[in-house]
Each structure stands twice: as C-alpha cells, then as structure tokens.
C-alpha cells in the first residue's frame, strides 16, 4: 500500500521540511490517491485483457466520466485559477459515484479501493477550503447517482470489467491534469 500522506519516503539527501502548505498537502493527497489507482489498475490488468484494448474501442462507452477541457481553465494556455478549482472539485464530486461502484470490484485490493474512495473525500474537503467561489460548485443529484449505480451493477461481467478499467483510467487522467493545474496555484 502507498505511504499515507505525511510520512517520509526513502530520501538520500532529503530536505528538512517546514510544515506542509495547503497546496503541498493537496499535491501529496492526490499523489497518494494516484498510487492507490496504480495498485488497482495492476489487479484489473492481471485479471482481464482490458488494458490492451485500444483507446478507440474503449471510447465506445456511455459513461459520462469527468474530463478536463480547454474551457475549464486548467491548462497552461488560458489558465484560470478559480474556474479550474471549481472544475476540479465538481469533477471529483462526479467521480464519487464511480468510486462507490469500484468498492465491490476487487478481491485482493479491497482495502486499496476503500482507501482511494476515502482519500478522495478528504481531497474534496481540502480543495473546498481553498476555493473562494463555492456557490459555483454543483453537487450531483443523489437520486440520479443511485440509479446510475444500479444500472452499472446490472451490466454483464465483460461490461463491468470494461467499466472498472475505464473509471480507473479516466480518474488517473483527471488527477494528473489536476496536479499540473494545482502546481500553478
């Protein structure tokens, strides 16, 4: 399992540090979640051949997974801190239903899946403290989420494997984009 944020890695000439700033704590939290995703992806790839599937084939799905776009202000060109922060928080809130779906999808990495889910909740709290414009953040409708979850769980085995792989890949890409954007804040 990845080292929880706040614990040291195996540094050779590691710097003595002051307490973490809020931005650095967020960076560390995202990296912790990404480490968890890497572990989950390993189990998924070992279990099925989804990881070899072409991006084009995988794109043929009806999942509405959050994705960064130019208008979100998170890329270097057209960067807008407040717009981007709202997009990151909104996106993470939208991913929560998919992270709930992942909870019963792993055998040997059950705890890891739970850690990713709980760490994401903590990350959202960190980011909400940083955001000035909380009114712009739309929270997903619980009823819509509940019916989506039921629909996903009713899929056949192959589609469930595909869904699991797509969620992990999309969440990883979303967090990578978030990391790069937060570096500019």
């Amino acid at each position: 399992a990845p080292v929880p944020p706040g614990e040291d890695s195996k540094d050779v000439a590691a710097p003595h540090r002051q307490p973490l700033t809020s931005s650095e704590r967020i960076d560390k939290q995202i990296r912790y979640i990404l480490d968890g995703i890497s572990a989950l992806r390993k189990e998924t790839c070992n279990k099925s051949n989804m990881c070899e599937s072409s991006k084009e084939a995988l794109a043929e799905n009806n999942l509405n997974l959050p994705k960064m776009a130019e208008k979100d202000g998170c890329f270097q060109s057209g960067f807008n801190e407040e717009t981007c922060l709202v997009k990151i928080i909104t996106g993470l809130l939208e991913f929560e239903v998919y992270l709930e779906y992942l909870q019963n999808r792993f055998e040997s990495s059950e705890e890891q899946a739970r850690a990713v889910q709980m760490s994401t909740k903590v990350l959202i709290q960190f980011l909400q403290k940083k955001a000035k414009n909380l009114d712009a953040i739309t929270t997903p409708d619980p009823t819509t989420n509940a019916s989506l979850l039921t629909k996903l769980q009713a899929q056949n085995q192959w589609l469930q494997d595909m869904t699991t792989h797509l969620i992990l890949r999309s969440f990883k890409e979303f967090l990578q984009s978030s990391l790069r954007a937060l570096r500019q804040m």
Epitope: S9, K10, D11, E24, D27, R31, S38, L179
Partner: nanobody, 126 residues
Framework: QVQLVESGGGLVQPGGSLRLSCAAS????????IGWFRQAPGKEREGVSC????????YYDDSVKGRFTISRDNVKNMVYLQMNSLKPEDTAVYFC???????????????????WGQGTQVTVSS
C-alpha cells in the same frame, strides 16, 4: 542501487551561463519525473524545474522561466539544466531528485521525490 550524481556547478559572473548534469544509475528514466531543486544558506529547498518522461510534462519556477531549460536523455540516463542569464540570487546548492511513481507528474515540492543527489554548488558573483 539507485544513485544520482550532479555536476557542472561552479563560479560564474552575473549574466553568465552554466549547464548542470544529473547522471542517474540503478534505474531507467523511462517512467519517472526528475526535478532540479536548489537551496541557499538558511533557506528552504525550492523547486526550480522538473521534467517527466511519460508525456514530456515540464515545470519551471517563475523565478527562472525564460532563463533555465531542462532536458533529458533517456538513452544516456542523464538530465540537464541549462542556466542562462544567471543572477546573484541564483547562488545555491543545486540538487537533482527522482520521483519513480508510474504517473510521472512533475512536482515543485520535494516530498514526492524518492531519491536525491548530494548537490553541486553554483555561485553567481562578480
């Protein structure tokens, strides 16, 4: 055994240039992010620049943008920092560090980096 060795530091006049090198051994640079940090006496270690292998993602601190350029040679397992238009405030010990995580996103903070070199001194003075 993982090892990072910096070289290329020295004494240079303001406006001058230096090229720092970081030689990596014990692993390949393919799936990693390599960062350059600096530490002036009595100050915190700060991120200067970083490059990741997976997608060529780069980061530069505002204080060095347009003056410093980071590059990597995965075949030779080397990372370089070309420093131009040097200023007295660039004086510090420069360290390279590697983050071996498989998502390779550059960080401007030291905490994600797994291994560090011992550093090379850069002094900018007339």
């Amino acid at each position: 055994q993982v090892q990072l060795v910096e070289s290329g530091g020295g004494l240079v006049q303001p406006g001058g240039s230096l090229r720092l090198s970081c030689a990596a051994s014990g692993f390949t640079l393919d799936d990693s992010a390599i960062g350059w940090f600096r530490q002036a006496p009595g100050k915190e270690r700060e991120g200067v620049s970083c490059i990741s292998s997976s997608d060529g993602d780069t980061y530069y601190d505002d204080s060095v943008k347009g003056r410093f350029t980071i590059s990597r040679d995965n075949v030779k397992n080397m990372v370089y920092l070309q420093m131009n238009s040097l200023k007295p405030e660039d004086t510090a010990v420069y360290f390279c560090a590697i983050d071996l995580s498989d998502y390779g996103v550059c960080s401007k903070w030291p905490s994600p980096y797994d291994y560090w070199g011992q550093g090379t001194q850069v002094t900018v003075s007339s």
